[in-house]
């Protein structure tokens, strides 16, 4: 039975040209996290495997930095980066947990972080 929950940074906004940290956290389970995949719609941004380290998709290699931790730093933001991002936690023995973050990249200089929320 999967008992864990993914806590994410929820809905966030950031300025064009700036950077943002995408972060998820798995709680309420003793399952071992073996890998975290970061995806935007149907496109893979990065993989962090507990043993093998990081894979960064070539199309993002100049704008994505591993970490902090299992998170992902997205740099040189453009308006086209607005959209849904998913952290997919591969765990043993539970299986897969998915968290969602919505990023809005703003033209203006005012960008505030949204509230944290949980996805079961």
């Amino acid at each position: 039975m999967m008992t864990g929950t993914i806590e994410t940074t929820g809905n966030i906004s950031a300025e064009k040209g700036g950077s943002i940290i995408l972060q998820c956290h798995l709680s309420s389970t003793t399952a071992q996290v073996t890998q975290v995949n970061w995806e935007q719609q149907d496109q893979l941004l990065a993989i962090c495997n507990a043993d093998l380290g990081w894979h960064i998709s070539p199309s993002f290699k100049d704008r994505v930095a591993p970490g902090p931790g299992l998170g992902l730093t997205l740099q040189s933001l453009t308006v086209n980066d607005t959209g849904e991002y998913f952290c997919i936690y591969h765990t043993y023995p539970d299986g897969t947990y998915t968290g969602r973050i919505f990023l809005e990249v703003l033209e203006s200089s005012v960008a505030e972080h949204g509230a944290r929320f949980q996805i079961p």
Partner: antibody, heavy 119, light 107 residues
Framework: EVQLVQSGAEVKKPGSSVKVSCKTS????????IHWVRQAPGQGLEWIGG????????IYNQIFRGRATLTVDKSTSTAYMELSSLRSEDTAVYFC????????????WGQGTTVTVSS | DIQMTQSPSSLSASVGDRVTITCKAS??????VVWYQQKPGKAPKLLIY???YRFTGVPSRFSGSGSGTDFTLTISSLQPEDFATYYC?????????FGGGTKVEIK
């Protein structure tokens, strides 16, 4: 020039063990994961597992867990794959291969080591 | 485990032909797919990764595409040195798995 040079062919009895070595050169050993892949005669490729010399992380394909052991000697930039409790189905060519940096793609390969298991 | 199914398993073609090999994943693998070329008695060689980037030194006649579950390797104009077996591989989740291979033979 990146090179991975493997040890020579082995003939083993069922139930015994084999240890294949993979001597690397031409790059910083601790910056790249070493994977092991095997190929039975006339068959496709099968991933055994990988070893990350940067933090000694080891990952195995579940079907080899408990029989395969991946190790490295950082002082000689050499990787090793030991397979125990050998059976005839383990007859194959065993390849060591390096993963590209920040990419889960195997960019350089050893020449392969033929392991024959026969009574 | 994720199964990678390649088709066809073999094909016959002539020099200059356009060749297309497909690879279907049993579940979503995003764009975490790699293609290798292997000649008899030799180790595989990295061709394409992620899944449309050519590895260093790979001729431009080789191209890859796809996302999700369906992937394609295309050789735009087959050359004599391209007769070999081609394998797809996914690294979306462990264990990493390979397709069964496609053998490209001379017609």
């Amino acid at each position: 020039e990146v090179q991975l040079v493997q040890s020579g062919a082995e003939v083993k009895k069922p139930g015994s063990s084999v240890k294949v070595s993979c001597k690397t050169s031409g790059y910083t050993f601790t910056e790249h994961v070493i994977h092991w892949v095997r190929q039975a005669p006339g068959q496709g490729l099968e991933w055994i597992g990988g070893f990350n010399p940067n933090h000694d992380g080891t990952i195995y394909n579940q079907i080899f867990r408990g029989r395969a052991t991946l190790t490295v000697d950082k002082s000689t930039s050499t990787a090793y794959m030991e397979l125990s409790s050998l059976r005839s189905e383990d007859t194959a060519v065993y390849f060591c291969t390096r993963a590209a940096k920040l990419l889960f793609a195997m960019d350089y390969w050893g020449q392969g080591t033929t392991v024959t298991v026969s009574s | 485990d994720i199964q990678m199914t390649q088709s066809p398993s073999s094909l016959s073609a002539s020099v200059g032909d356009r060749v297309t090999i497909t690879c279907k994943a049993s579940q979503h693998v995003s764009n975490a797919v790699v293609w290798y070329q292997q000649k008899p008695g030799k180790a595989p060689k990295l061709l394409i990764y992620s899944p449309s980037y050519r590895f260093t030194g790979v001729p431009s006649r080789f191209s890859g595409s796809g996302s999700g579950t369906d992937f394609t390797l295309t050789i735009s104009s087959l050359q004599p040195e391209d007769f070999a077996t081609y394998y797809c591989q996914q690294h979306y989740s462990t264990p990493w798995t390979f397709g069964g291979g496609t053998k490209v033979e001379i017609k």
